[in-house]
């Protein structure tokens, strides 16, 4: 796995421990918590990052209205089970044998049950809506400049292919970034929109996952773009299954 060979560190994930005893005597970086060797040339999966985090010494509107099937991550942090590739296992359980099904970004998509709960497949989150509110500025940002800057950010910092940034909407002070990536569109080596969204979320909270890089310094035509609130909606290829009790 690629890592900075000279001093054996992982540029894309600071929640790793690296040592020069990988294949061929190369630098190998392991995610804290799981011990899985990660590829430091790209983003680490959200599942491995969450596991590491849990183990760490610890009108004519242009804005999109999320539909009734959109999920928000209200459950907060948990210690997830990841598969050998670092993806979330479809069924997650806690220490008290309470289980639930999750989507590909690890967000619960069913009611909680017991160990008999079945989650037949990992349902893909194909549409992510990142809803941001920026701090007051002298004037509104130019929409096309803002669009270009956010697309550049996702392309350069998170290595997300530009085709997966579907749209950037702006209605001061709210910015919405739409990421779309169907199963059929995602080729081997493509960064997953869920991983990119998670890195972005941590960046805007001032909790960058990148090694040694400064925090996120977003500027639009030299004007700082400071985010004061973030809300992320997740839409799955198959709608979630919650009981009516939860919806009322």
């Amino acid at each position: 796995h690629t890592a900075a060979q000279d001093n054996c560190t992982c540029p894309t994930n600071k929640m790793t421990v690296c040592s020069p005893d990988g294949p061929g005597g190369r630098c190998q970086c392991r995610a804290l918590g799981s011990g899985v060797a990660v590829d430091c040339s790209t983003l680490t999966s959200k599942c491995l990052l969450l596991k590491a985090r849990m183990s760490a010494p610890k009108n004519a509107r242009t804005l999109v209205r999320p539909n009734e099937h959109a999920l928000v991550d209200n459950d907060g942090l948990y210690d997830p089970d990841c598969d050998p590739e670092g993806r979330f296992k479809a069924r997650q359980c806690n220490q008290t044998s309470v289980c639930w099904c999750v989507n590909s970004v690890g967000v619960r998509r069913t009611d909680k049950g017991d160990l008999s709960l079945r989650c037949d497949e990992l349902v893909r989150t194909h549409h992510i809506l990142i809803d941001l509110r920026h701090r007051p500025t002298a004037g509104a940002f130019n929409h096309s400049d803002l669009d270009a800057e956010l697309r550049r950010l996702f392309r350069e910092r998170y290595r997300l292919h530009p085709k997966f940034v579907a749209a950037v909407h702006y209605e001061q002070p709210t910015i919405q970034i739409e990421l779309r990536q169907n199963t059929s569109q995602k080729a081997a080596g493509d960064v997953d929109i869920g991983d990119a969204a998670y890195y972005f979320e941590r960046d805007v909270k001032g909790e960058s996952l990148f090694q040694g890089r400064g925090g996120l310094d977003l500027r639009v035509r030299g004007e700082p773009l400071q985010v004061e609130r973030t809300l992320i909606y997740y839409l799955d290829e198959i709608p979630p299954k919650f009981s009516m009790k939860r919806l009322t």
């Epitope: 054996c8 005893d21 011990g35």
Partner: antibody, heavy 115, light 107 residues
């Protein structure tokens, strides 16, 4: 050359804590994981856990998590494993090893737990 | 935890024979598998790392292959000094685990 030198055989009473040591030489101690492995007479090998000396990150096999404690002393390039409340089941040879593919092994420390 | 299953448990061979030892993982571990030899009253010795990479000082008659879940240690023309226990070990994720071993004995 790389060497891992382990402390001598130990005879302890059941319930009495014991601390084994592993002194590393011939390489940069802080750059490689140190693992501890248990082997009962005529049995297989069992991974207890590991520690990364640079940041003292530790991982444990769930089976040993409550009773084994791994530490290091970077100044002397020495790793330690403390075993609390040992029973006869803990009578075994304990090896320290280096890395992920365990390329260097200590000579082993024989622990006997007996009253 | 990842379970490693070694087969056969015992292999009786004549010096000069060529043998294959198997190690199967309960889930994919890429190439993160290592092979060790252990003789009575000695520490184990690394023979092959990362499924197929040779180790300095280990005779060339030892070779490894496999990826994912199925791995093989081959000994081309066994010599008397090769008799003993052979263990596989995975370093794909914590906790690291070992196979239960294959005993190579003289027929």
């Amino acid at each position: 050359q790389v060497q891992l030198q382990q402390s001598g055989a130990e005879l302890v009473r059941p319930g009495a804590s014991v601390k084994l040591s592993c002194k590393a030489s011939g390489y940069t101690f802080t750059s490689y994981w140190i693992n501890w492995v248990k082997q009962r007479p005529g049995q297989g090998l069992e991974w207890i856990g590991n520690i990364f000396p640079s940041g003292s990150y530790t991982n444990y096999n769930q089976k040993f998590k409550d009773r084994a404690t791994l530490t290091v002393d970077k100044s002397s390039s020495t790793a330690f494993m403390q075993l609390s409340s040992p029973t006869s089941e803990d009578s075994a040879i304990y090896f320290c090893t280096r890395g992920s593919g365990f390329d260097y092994w200590g000579q082993g420390t024989t622990l006997t737990v007996s009253s | 935890d990842i379970v490693l299953t070694q087969s056969p448990a015992t292999l009786s061979v004549t010096p000069g024979d060529s043998v294959s030892l198997s190690c199967r993982a309960s889930q994919s571990i890429s190439n993160n598998l290592h092979w060790y030899q252990q003789k009575s009253h000695e520490s184990p010795r690394l023979l092959i790392k990362y499924a197929s990479q040779s180790i300095s000082g280990i005779p060339s008659r030892f070779s490894g292959s496999g990826s994912g879940t199925d791995f093989t240690l081959s000994i081309n023309s066994v010599e008397t000094e090769d008799f003993g226990m052979y263990f596989c070990q995975q370093s794909n994720s914590w906790p690291f685990t070992f196979g239960s071993g294959t005993k190579l004995e003289i027929k």
